[in-house]
Interface confidence: low
Amino acid sequence: KKVVLGKKGDTVELTCTASQKKSIQFHWKNSNQIKILGNQGSFLTKGPSKLNDRADSRRSLWDQGNFPLIIKNLKIEDSDTYICEVEDQKEEVQLLVFGLTANSDTHLLQGQSLTLTLESPPGSSPSVQCRSPRGKNIQGGKTLSVSQLELQDSGTWTCTVLQNQKKVEFKIDIVVLAFQKASSIVYKKEGEQVEFSFPLAFTVEKLTGSGELWWQAERASSSKSWITFDLKNKEVSVKRVTQDPKLQMGKKLPLHLTLPQALPQYAGSGNLTLALEAKTGKLHQEVNLVVMRATQLQKNLTCEVWGPTSPKLMLSLKLENKEAKVSKREKAVWVLNPEAGMWQCLLSDSGQVLLESNIKVLPTWSTPVQP
């Protein structure tokens, strides 16, 4: 018996071939011997089966001795043994129809779970293997679960259903709703304007929700809400903003925040949350601000950084075009009695400069100049 696998909602063509290459009488029946369709001369005739409005054949092939049964908009319950009667012979074809659906919306928040459910005919014992867009393979039976969805899981999931050594492939488009970056860090000199950007890693026609930026300054004992905003059809409107600092927010996507000045008291970490309409849970992006200050007080030249730096980072003070005078894995370094000239304060990671601040040290009778 020939086995054919079909996909729910698709069209399947079951073949039936006569030895004579001409139009002769044929009938297609189901396992209950109920006639589905056949011919009377060159006319297609249909029986009383439940497939009546979804069954068809290809008249153009009859003259070649081919009498296919075409079933449109397949349903799981169409799974059956179909019998083609032609030339006093019977050809049996077993059709097995499968469906694969995502248990929830195909737009899921990062960190949520995806469950794929296989609909299969009674008596079948299929195996399923799905491949995520990043090449991860997941195997299962009637259900497949993927917990903790990541941004790279966005895209087309290809699932292969295997039954009787035959396979059928399903493609499901999954969109993981997330920010492009889980975390970002901004390095700024004291006084500079700070730009925070929160690009989304997906595009949808209409985007509505609300968001908030909570900030934990390094110098503060508790975190505070810096800004709250609404998102309506990709338009951003500020609801509430602190007076210090007074953030400005762009009116369009991507979400964009401007801090007029980087100051030591603002250095720290923030968490931007975005709650989307009709979605449970929130999107998160962490943002970090590191602020550098170089100062000269009497005979002491000091370089300091505030904010979430790691011990891997090197803080240095050097006279321009010379070797570093001091270089430490610390948040503050200083030089006593610095010689006159342009001094550089550098924050670097494995030799790569992340932040630089210059200060001009004048001969001892004058005051320092900060360029």
Epitope: G135, Q152, G155, Q180, K181, S184, P199, A201, F202, T203
Partner: antibody, heavy 124, light 107 residues
């Protein structure tokens, strides 16, 4: 038509500098991670540097670390490679290459679009 | 760094032949492997990504398989236009690394 066009190659003395540019067209440049890959005459391919779509992540091969700087200007649809302290062993055809992806994000690692390459010769 | 060892380094075959190139990674790279074709004087071209996926527009005579440390690239029926150097490349870890290449010639 999706394409990448490199420029800026040429003959330079050891210790010298060059700045390579790569102009992108036909796709949303700001959505894709980009790379520089080089090929010394008669030799194989060597990955040089990577930059993510919004420049958050930058990586270099050990052989160029501290001497080369990758950057991009998404407003100008351009990728750059600043090469300082050049050595004879940096002589190669330099290709800019796009990482496979789409407007939602990138799929790490496969270079689906390449430029025609620009020749850099370091010789005294 | 992950080393990629390709073999053979050169190969001579006739039109219509089945051609196989292998690539071995110095550590498990799952299926994070791509195959490229480079014709003389031209830029490389992506043929296979994720070890076995055929890039859009690439003829079906090209295929790839393997996982972990051992990978295979196959041309089912060699055509004259397939004369080129073929490279494997891993992207399990930065730095991305390429195999040394396999130069394919027609007998």
């Amino acid at each position: 038509e999706v394409q990448l066009v490199e420029s800026g190659g040429g003959l330079v003395k050891p210790g010298g500098s060059l700045r390579l540019s790569c102009a992108a067209s036909g796709f949303t440049f700001s959505s894709y991670s980009m790379n520089w890959v080089r090929q010394a005459p008669g030799k194989g391919l060597e990955w040089v540097s990577f930059i993510s779509s919004s420049s958050s992540y930058i990586y270099y091969a050990d052989s160029v670390k501290g001497r080369f700087t990758i950057s991009r200007d998404n407003a100008k649809n351009s990728l750059y490679l600043q090469m300082n302290s050049l050595r004879a062993e940096d002589t190669a055809v330099y290709y800019c290459a796009r990482e496979r992806g789409d407007d939602y994000g990138d799929y790490e690692g496969a270079f689906d679009i390449w430029g025609q390459g620009t020749m850099v010769t370091v010789s005294s | 760094d992950i080393q990629m060892t390709q073999s053979p380094s050169s190969l001579s075959a006739s039109v219509g032949d089945r051609v196989t190139i292998t690539c071995q990674a110095s550590q498990d790279i799952s299926n994070y492997l791509n195959w490229y074709q480079q014709k003389p004087g031209k830029a490389p071209k992506l043929l296979i990504y994720d070890a076995s996926n055929l890039e859009t527009g690439v003829p079906s005579r090209f295929s790839g398989s393997g996982s972990g440390t051992d990978f295979t690239f196959t041309i089912s029926s060699l055509q004259p236009e397939d004369i080129a150097t073929y490279y494997c490349q891993q992207y399990d870890n930065l730095p991305y690394t390429f195999g040394q290449g396999t130069k394919l010639e027609i007998k």
